[in-house]
């Protein structure tokens, strides 16, 4: 039976590589995937023309982090 990606078990992973514009970093498999495969929209880099992620936001929920926390400019760094 497939058991999926291994947990880091406390070992630091390298910082995620920035993804190309049409891709987003999947934190569970720890690599870039097509943004459209994920449920949650990622903030787009300023001026980016890549297609918007597939899903709508949760009602009243901003895709950015909470107060005082700026969204990072590259989806791959989330």
């Amino acid at each position: 039976m497939r058991r999926g990606p291994r947990s880091l078990r406390g070992r630091d992973a390298p910082a995620p590589t920035p993804c190309v514009p049409a891709e987003c970093f999947d934190l569970l498999v720890r690599h870039c995937v097509a943004c459209g495969l994920l449920r949650t929209p990622r903030p787009k880099p300023a001026g980016a023309s890549s297609p918007a992620p597939r899903t709508a936001l949760q009602p009243q929920e901003s895709v950015g982090a909470g107060a005082g926390e700026a969204a990072l400019p590259l989806p791959g760094l989330l």
Epitope: R3, G10, T40, L78
Partner: antibody, heavy 118, light 113 residues
């Protein structure tokens, strides 16, 4: 808005099997990560496993391969097949959608009770 | 797996009280990307859990401002500044930094004094 509805719970004898269903509406299970979480009576929450957009699965190692998660994308439903059930598997089983940007469970089903008893 | 330990397991408080619940993880919850994926859920009897706070200190949509979260590394706190009747429930911390598996604390039950 995403909604999840579980079904399939009930009474089963030790050693028996049961399949739970979670029907999703408002979003497609072809995208993201779809989870099962359980809660024994009077106890805390325990993550069971997920099925991903690609159909890959990952399970809590404590379950020792007795549980299998699958999906039927045509019905927008995913399942938890439970085999070799034990009394300690008695719990309310919730399905939950993962916010895969911030890694929290943002949508939960209402829960379905599984009782393992002779 | 990461162990999450909450304290106290239960507490009795009155409406208007300030309530503090602590959560400690068995290792640092700072992800290699710099984020800390520590969340808090509220659960009422017979109901599914509901997200309150995500990533240590961010209130989820619709959560009243009396709920706040703080902490870093391995030690985290959920504070209810002025307890309201609807806040009597069980609260769980959860980590998503070292996943899978996702892990939860054992819960803190907030009861009426």
């Amino acid at each position: 808005e995403v909604q999840l509805v579980e079904s399939g719970g009930g009474l089963v004898q030790p050693g028996g099997s049961l399949r739970l269903s979670c029907a999703a509406s408002g979003d497609s299970i072809n995208f993201g990560y779809w989870n099962w979480v359980r809660q024994a009576p009077g106890k805390g929450l325990e993550w069971v496993g997920y099925i991903s957009y690609s159909g890959s699965t990952y399970y809590n190692p404590s379950l020792k391969s007795r549980f299998t998660i699958s999906r039927d994308t045509s019905k927008n439903t995913f399942y938890l097949q439970m085999n070799s059930l034990r009394a300690e598997d008695t719990a309310v089983y919730y399905c939950a959608a993962l916010n895969d940007l911030f890694l929290y469970f943002d949508v939960w089903g209402q829960g379905t009770l599984v009782t393992v008893s002779s | 797996d990461i162990q999450m330990t909450q304290s106290p397991s239960s507490l009795s408080a009155s409406v208007g009280d300030r309530v503090t619940i602590t959560c400690r993880s068995s290792q640092s919850l700072v992800h290699s990307n710099g984020n800390t994926y520590l969340h808090w859920y509220q659960q009422k009897p017979g109901k599914a859990p509901k997200l309150l706070i995500y990533k240590v200190s961010n209130r989820f949509s619709g959560v009243p401002s009396r709920f706040s979260g703080s902490g870093s590394g391995t030690d985290f706190t959920l504070t209810i500044s002025s307890l309201q009747p609807e806040d009597f429930a069980t609260y769980y911390c959860s980590q998503s930094t070292h996943v899978p598996p996702f892990t939860f604390g054992q819960g803190t039950k907030v009861e009426i004094k």
